[in-house]
Interface confidence: low
């Protein structure tokens, strides 16, 4: 229903703590360079204003839309043009164009230093002195680096962060307690960031219909006992919620997400038998738990899908009468039977089914034409299954680091024009799929692998879109979202690429590498590996193994030397010479 004051309505629904957190996230995602102190000042002003509207909904400006209120706040920032350049031009526009303009200026790769976790003692001190400010900094730092992070989920991670610090800061060995727990939160949050970016990409590029199809498939897998119309209702709600968050309507998004959780918990009987444990939790944890819920058991007596979608003589009539509903029902029926498939694969099958009906229902004998459609799914199913098998075997053989390197070589050969830092980031993330998915039971591997890879490749596409350099990447990124992963997998060595000149300085290292944490050391080595491939795109696996092994020994030797600097200075040029020779 309509409310006199939208901001008062959201404040009352969300409560002050969540309201402030969401406003901070919103401002941090729009103006990514502003310091925390500046944002928190704005948050307080907006909160005070919301309180006046709660007290009197007829007070001045309380009837304005949240976009208008937020936009006016952002546009009042002094020196906006100095810090943000053309983003300041947005302020000349009226709503809703002004908000659209802000969204277009979100930067997926802001020029910010990597978020450094403070040392355990220092972290606990500042947390204990002012927990609210500490967690506010966390929200700000994550939100500005991930401008599409799903806001209500970020509040959940802040809550987790709070729990970990509350527990560990009383321990004698704070670091031993904090490190693994915060690493786990960070890992989950980073995966959540790329998954949500994919959802926003889907919404931005292909619209609500495409996103809703994704949601129908996902919900049908999770809730195979729910009826189609129930799934449709859930998918419609999830689509609305994600549209709001991707569009910067974070208060409405969080409020609607809480409403959906409430609805699901009130209607467990018609959705899933697995919800009860989630429904006993407080709001943020409840929504998160429902989002991660395990699949319900598939009904035992499901008939063959062929009966309604192939053998029924009325297939073309049903399709013609309500195409979207008929295809939606097909997607629902197929997905609820296949929790072992990725959503991307299910959407490919639905697309294939749709194309078959489009073709066959225009012909003389439709049943004869579409009669073999289910058999024609086979190659579409086999392709990702083989991908999982070969990649998991490679991961088991090489381990995570070695697997990342194999992926890095593969992708540098496919798209050598892409910047080395982007290739290294993508390969490291793609390589993590092994640790994340290959250890799972067989039935869970395919959905885990393919849907994760799709999200990581979306990140590659988003970064490449900013500065397009590879025609092949542009081609894969421009097509349908569900075809991206197969498109990238099918890419081979780019024959049009002119190899990079061999620059000795690219392969020159100093003693500072010795003190780097393991992760940073790996990145240095992987940067060198990508550069080697760019120099010799057709280098064999053995050649690359030789050079990288040599390089690892060189680093190891010099880091153990008494005079490290001297070792790097003298041994470095020898390494470069040997590498050139090995790759000749």
């Amino acid at each position: 229903e309509a409310h006199k004051s939208e901001i008062a309505h959201r404040f009352k629904d969300l409560g002050e703590q969540h309201f402030k957190g969401l406003v901070l996230i919103a401002f941090s995602q729009y103006l990514q360079k502003c310091p925390y102190e500046e944002h928190i000042k704005l948050v307080q002003e907006v909160t005070d204003f919301a309180k006046t509207c709660v007290a009197d909904e007829n007070a001045e400006n309380c009837d304005k839309s949240i976009h208008t209120l937020f936009g006016d706040k952002l546009c009042a920032i002094p020196k906006l043009r100095d810090n943000y350049g053309e983003l300041a031009d947005c302020c000349a526009k009226q709503e809703p164009e002004r908000n659209e303009c802000f969204l277009q200026h979100k930067d997926d790769n802001p020029n910010l230093p990597p978020f450094q976790r403070p040392e355990a003692e220092a972290m606990c001190t500042s947390f204990q002195e002012n927990p609210t400010s500490f967690l506010g900094h966390y929200l700000h730092e994550v939100a500005r680096r991930h401008p599409y992070f799903y806001a209500p989920e970020l509040l959940y991670y802040a809550e987790k962060y709070n729990e970990v610090l509350t527990q560990c800061c009383t321990e004698s060995d704070k670091a031993a307690c904090l490190t693994p727990k915060l690493d786990a939160v960070k890992e989950k949050a980073l995966v959540a960031a790329v998954r949500q970016r994919m959802k926003c990409s889907s919404m931005q590029r292909f619209g609500e219909r495409a996103f809703k199809a994704w949601a129908v498939a996902r919900m049908s897998q999770r809730f195979p006992n729910a009826e189609f119309a129930e799934i449709t209702k859930l998918a419609t709600d999830v689509t609305k919620i994600n549209k709001e968050c991707c569009h910067g309507d974070l208060l409405e998004c969080a409020d609607d997400r809480a409403e959906l959780a409430k609805y699901m918990c009130e209607n467990q009987a018609t959705i899933s038998s697995k919800l009860q444990a989630c429904c006993d939790k407080p709001v943020l944890q409840k929504s998160q738990c429902l989002a991660e819920i395990e699949h319900d058991n598939i009904p035992a007596d499901l008939p063959s899908i062929a009966a309604d979608f192939v053998e029924d003589k009325e297939v073309c009539k049903n399709y013609a009468e309500a195409k979207d509903v008929f295809l939606g029902t097909f997607l629902y029926e197929y997905s609820r039977r296949h929790p072992d498939y990725s959503v991307s694969l299910l959407l490919r099958l639905a697309k294939k089914y749709e194309a078959t009906l489009e073709k066959c229902c225009a012909e003389g004998d439709p049943p004869a034409c579409y009669g073999t459609v289910l058999a024609e799914f086979q190659p579409l199913v086999e392709e990702p299954k083989n991908l999982v098998k070969t990649n998991c075997e490679l991961y088991e053989k090489l381990g995570e680091y070695g697997f990342q390197n194999a992926v890095l070589v593969r992708y540098t050969q496919k798209a050598p024009q892409v910047s080395t830092p982007t290739l290294v980031e993508a390969a490291r993330n793609l390589g993590r799929v092994g640790t994340k998915c290959c250890t799972l039971p067989e039935a869970q591997r395919l959905p885990c692998v393919e849907d994760y890879l799709s999200a990581i490749l979306n990140r590659l596409c988003v970064l490449h879109e900013k500065t397009p350099v590879s025609e092949k990447v542009t081609k894969c990124c421009s097509g349908s979202l569900v075809e991206r992963r197969p498109c990238f997998s099918a890419l081979t060595v780019d024959e049009t690429y002119v190899p990079k000149e061999f620059k000795a300085e690219t392969f020159t290292f100093h003693s500072d590498i010795c003190t780097l944490p393991d992760k940073e050391k790996q990145i240095k080595k992987q940067t060198a590996l990508a550069e080697l491939v760019k120099h010799k795109p057709k280098a064999t696996e053995d050649q690359l193994k030789t050079v990288m092994g040599d390089f690892a020994q060189f680093v190891d030797k010099c880091c153990k030397a008494a005079d490290k600097d001297n070792c790097f200075a003298t041994e470095g040029p020898n390494l470069v010479a040997r590498s050139k020779e090995a790759l000749a």
Epitope: E227, F228, K233, N267, A269, D312, E321, A322, V325, E333
Partner: nanobody
Amino acid sequence: QVQLVESGGGLVQPGGSLRLSCAASGRTFIAYAMGWFRQAPGKEREFVAAITNFAGGTTYYADSVKGRFTISRDNAKTTVYLQMNSLRAEDTAVYYCAADRSAQTMRQVRPVLPYWGQGTLVTVSS
């Protein structure tokens, strides 16, 4: 949106049969579970039968009609049927067709359903 119109009611002798039809208009018929309810004079409306959204879907029945009544649907004709056999005097009522997102919710004591028909009278009497 779905509009529902029932037909097929009438006077029948005990032990006889009737087939009720409910024609739905609206392009999203196959998105809905369909059901039949009845209301006898001076009594509350009660659940009779429901079927999930797709042809050959799962069916649910009230204990009092199990084995005698059969619910079915034809999505091509956007129609739901209630075949009533071995009719008894206590089956006399106005029979209503209904549509909802879920066949299971229809079985609740007083379901608040989004779509109802106007009803068709069934009288079982000798």
